[in-house]
């Protein structure tokens, strides 16, 4: 997605994005909370495709690993947190049934706040 | 994804999430920037599924439409911005070629900052 830094902007939380293959992912959590095996290849007409997922998470090496950037620290505690979304993937469940299921993947790094008590 | 409010937390930016069907999405932008038609049905082994996308965007009705929550306003200007990610979808391009392509969808609402000048 477009880079805020190009517009002279900073993100409140630093994130990293990468393409992850099913071979690297191996397993995932489906919408019912069950663990499923993510299949490496998807059959398509005239061949197979490797399953890839575009994942974004909080940067553990970034400036914001101790808290979010730009927060009013007198009133708030802050934390950068990886959030998840759902994508459909070809998977195999515990009953060895192969099918397309929605799985959770990391898609963003957002800032969460808690009010500072007893100032 | 898990709700920060349940843990007594607030998000720096308010977002809304919903399932969007390909039938309602109709078109999308692929990785090369081209517009593609998103197909409603995906053929699977002995069946067909409806294509759905889980989309998250900034809440236009939320408290944070004027700026991010909890920011140190003495030093920063802030804005909540919808960010996008890539998911694979069955699509048709302008040449009527059907295939699996990565398309951009809204996946998050994050806060971007710019330094206040001339204080």
């Amino acid at each position: 997605h477009s880079d805020p830094a190009r517009r002279g902007e900073l993100s409140v939380c630093d994130s990293i994005s990468e393409w992850v293959t099913a071979a690297d992912k191996k397993t995932a959590v489906d919408m019912s909370g069950g663990t499923v095996t993510v299949l490496e290849k998807v059959p398509v007409s005239k061949g197979q495709l490797k399953q890839y997922f575009y994942e974004t998470k909080c940067n553990p090496m970034g400036y914001t690993k101790e808290g979010c950037r730009g927060i009013d620290k007198r009133h708030w505690n802050s934390q950068c947190r990886t959030t998840q979304s759902y994508v459909r993937a070809l998977t195999m469940d515990s009953k060895k049934r192969i099918g397309w299921r929605f799985i959770r993947i990391d898609t963003s790094c957002v800032c969460t706040l808690t009010i500072k008590r007893g100032r | 994804h898990s709700d920060p409010a349940r843990r007594g937390e607030l998000s720096v930016c308010d977002s809304i999430s919903e399932w969007v069907t390909a039938a309602d999405k109709k078109t999308a932008v692929d990785m090369s920037g081209g517009t593609v038609t998103v197909l409603e049905k995906v053929p699977v082994s002995k069946g067909q599924l409806k294509q759905y996308f889980y989309e998250t965007k900034c809440n236009p009705m939320g408290y944070t439409k004027e700026g991010c929550r909890g920011i140190d306003k003495r030093h920063w200007n802030s804005q909540c911005r919808t960010t996008q990610s890539y998911v694979r979808a069955l699509t048709m391009d302008s040449k009527k070629r059907i295939g699996w392509r990565f398309i951009r969808i809204d996946t998050s609402c994050v806060c971007t900052l710019t330094i206040k000048r001339g204080r």
Partner: antibody, heavy 118, light 108 residues
């Protein structure tokens, strides 16, 4: 809690029209396909029509195609079925049903009875 | 259109007995099959989806099995509240979504 409440049923003569409504609550209405399923007295279930979350796509059973129109108003969380040129064989309880992401029905209303009789 | 045939039409059993209901599809539908329960004067209720996955809040005595064209709903030990009509529904090929004709489970 998810709730679906149908209304608008009644007794009409063959050839007449009727409009059914289904008021939905307890879920993000605009995210899901909604359907009408009917059940003739003492008979089984018959799927009638379905509509996508924002109304971009509609489907009909052959038995009602050209006579029935499904629609929705997401601002009111309401599903509709406009039934024209009604026939005796359309007599049934009409259920509104919420579709899951995988094309089966996880919630149903209690139904509204439509009787077509001369 | 895919035709679903349920058998038997009626099953007469006593509480505590095991009920086995069958649903046959006119062509293979993988595991894209759901089961519903309907009691008199009530709306149908989802029991099983994807042939063998129990819906939220459904007791463990209900189980589904099968794939392709042959499917089974089993109630391991019938309770008084289980006497009802049961329908299968396919969602492999649509429209139309199709239902079986139903199996009535009645008290013997």
């Amino acid at each position: 809690d998810v709730q679906l409440v149908e209304s608008g049923g009644g007794v009409v003569r063959p050839g007449e029209s009727l409009r059914l409504s289904c008021a939905a609550s307890g879920f993000t209405f605009s995210s899901y396909y909604m359907n009408w399923v009917r059940q003739a007295p003492g008979k089984g279930l018959e799927w009638v029509s379905g509509i996508s979350g924002r109304g971009g796509s509609t489907y009909y059973a052959d038995s009602v195609k050209g006579r029935f129109t499904i629609s929705r108003d997401n601002s009111k969380n309401t599903l509709y079925l406009q039934m024209n040129s009604l026939r005796a064989e359309d007599t049934a309880i009409y259920y509104c049903a919420k579709e899951t992401l995988n094309v089966f029905f996880d919630y149903w209303g209690l139904g509204t009875l439509v009787t077509v009789s001369s | 259109e895919i035709v679903l045939t349920q058998s038997p039409g009626t099953l007469s059993l006593s509480p505590g007995e095991r009920a086995t209901l069958s649903c046959r599809a006119s062509q293979p539908i993988n595991y894209y099959l759901a089961w519903y329960q309907q009691k008199p004067g009530q709306a149908p209720r989802l029991l099983i989806y994807d042939a063998s996955s129990r819906a939220t809040g459904i007791p463990a005595r209900f189980s589904g099995s099968g794939s392709g064209t042959e499917f089974t709903l089993t109630i391991s030990s019938l309770q008084s509240e289980d006497f009802a009509v049961y329908y299968c529904q396919q969602y492999s090929d649509w429209p139309p979504l199709t239902f079986g004709g139903g199996t009535k489970v009645e008290i013997k």
